[in-house]
């Protein structure tokens, strides 16, 4: 990354330009590099007590580049940083830091969680759900002929996943008890989604007329709804109701 | 808190001369290039100069360059601009700023108006 | 030096609409690029930083985006403190040089 450096030559004079290593324009015996070439940059590194002069192609990591007219230097960012934009900005904090609005932080603060991917302070995602769909068809094992009693489903829509730190999402599933005007199955509709059955071709004098699988089949010696009076479909609307139930898988 | 206050403005006639101060506070003053940036009325901003951390060096926007210099005084955390040979167009609003890259203090200005 | 051509020069918005504020830079910059807010009367304010970091303070309705030549700014959801002028500068080199500025105002 940081190709040529320039290093301080032996028996070399103060601001001497003959003999510099590497990128160096002028360099030192004692200070190493004192300007660089065109383009590249100029840093100090500190080795024991003494700061060498160094000619890069870019800013090492923790330091930040700015091209004056006259000489590109390379300034230290702040110590907790790796990558900074200046003094005031880090956009990548070293190791053990998470980065919130250009400062490294130990902890994220309240109401923010710890990206531990792009180790940054991110805010807390809540979960978000659609509107529920309409209900599905009343069905029993599949089939919406041929019984009193069956099921309904709803489903919703995750918007919105949540984070680490964000609320969970509520059921996405929903299925309650429906009751539906029994009527008997069309031809073809039996065994529909469900359970299929063969069966032999009518005999000369049968109905040709489906007949439900007896399984689908509440009772048949039960009272049709339709002969139900007025009063108790109203009691077995406020009881199914009552009944519905929410199962789901929460996200 | 950071706080940056420019002095000096006022009225000039043409050729004449003009020094501006910025007083800051509130930061290391002696980390920061600091510079002058200027806007003229109802026009957009326009970068004059910018003096390094230590003083030793200055650059200076074409518009200005041989009639401005600029100065620090890292004992008193200040920052000079002086003026010479002003011109008509030479009145704005002057800034000061901490300039490390982008702008990223400033002061709320001082008007310098060269009219005859 | 680099130029900067920051557009459109004005715009006339309502609160809640969704403003893209434009700056086209001579040569390529990579993201050191700075978006500032200006308010009659006041001193400029930085915005965004490194092309797309928001300034601590900044809410989260503005974003910054783009690197290399082409930089966007777009506030989603105007709210009444928003309509001001915003410059774009570059900080890749020296000289610093900004946008003409666009002033925003209500519609």
């Known amino acids: 990354q940081n190709a040529s450096r320039g290093r301080r030559q032996r028996r070399m004079h103060p601001n001497v330009s003959q003999g510099c290593q590497g990128g160096c324009a002028t360099c030192s015996d004692y200070n190493g590099c004192l300007s660089c070439k065109p383009r590249l940059f100029f840093a100090l590194e500190r080795i024991g007590m003494k700061q060498i002069g160094v000619c890069l192609s870019s800013c090492p990591s923790g330091y930040y580049g700015t091209r004056y007219p006259d000489i590109n230097k390379c300034t230290k960012c702040k110590a907790d940083c790796d990558t900074c934009f200046n003094k005031n900005f880090c956009t990548k904090c070293k190791s053990g830091f998470y980065l919130h609005l250009g400062k490294c932080l130990d902890n994220c603060p309240e109401g923010l969680e710890a990206n531990n991917h792009t180790m940054e302070c991110v805010s807390i995602v809540h979960c978000e759900v659609s509107e529920w769909n309409p209900w599905s068809p009343c069905t029993k094992k599949g089939k919406t002929c041929g019984f009193k009693r069956g099921t309904e489903t709803r489903v919703r829509e995750i918007i919105q996943h949540p984070s680490a730190k964000g609320n969970l999402c509520p059921p996405t599933n929903e299925t309650r008890k429906c009751t539906v005007q029994r009527k008997k199955c069309q031809k073809g509709e039996r065994g529909k989604k469900g359970r299929e059955r063969k069966r032999k071709k009518p005999n000369k004098g049968e109905s040709k007329e489906a007949i439900p699988d007896s399984k689908s089949l509440e009772s048949s010696k039960e009272i049709p709804e339709q002969r139900e009076n007025k009063q108790q479909q109203k009691k077995r609307k406020v009881q199914d109701k009552q009944k519905s139930v929410s199962v789901s898988t929460v996200h | 808190e950071v706080q940056l206050v420019e002095s000096g403005g006022g009225v000039v006639q043409p050729g004449r001369s003009l020094r501006l101060s910025c007083a800051a506070s509130g930061f290391t003053f002696s980390d920061y290039d600091m510079a002058w940036v200027r806007q003229a009325p109802g026009k957009g901003l326009e970068w004059v100069a910018t003096?390094?951390?230590?003083?030793?060096?200055?650059y200076f926007g074409d518009s200005v360059r041989g009639r401005f210099t600029v100065s620090r005084d890292n004992s008193k955390n200040t920052l000079y601009l002086q003026m010479n040979s002003l011109r008509a167009e030479d009145t704005a609003v002057y800034y000061c700023t901490a300039h490390d890259r982008s702008f990223d203090y400033w002061g709320q200005g001082t008007m310098v108006t060269v009219s005859s | 030096d680099i130029q900067m051509t920051q557009s459109p020069s004005s715009l006339s918005a309502s609160v809640g609409d969704r403003v893209t504020i434009t700056c086209l830079v001579s040569e390529d910059i990579s993201n050191d690029f700075v978006w500032y807010q200006q308010k009659p009367g006041k001193s400029p304010k930085l915005l965004i930083y490194a092309a797309s970091r928001l300034q601590d303070g900044v809410p989260s309705r503005f974003s910054g985006s783009g690197s290399g030549t082409d930089f966007t700014l777009t506030i989603s959801s105007l709210q009444p403190e928003d309509f001001a002028t915003y410059f774009c500068?570059?900080?890749?080199?020296?000289?610093?040089?900004f946008g003409q500025g666009t002033k925003l105002e209500i519609k």
């Open positions: 500068q570059q900080s890749y080199k020296y000289p610093p040089t």
């Open positions: 003096i390094i951390y230590d003083g030793s060096r200055a």
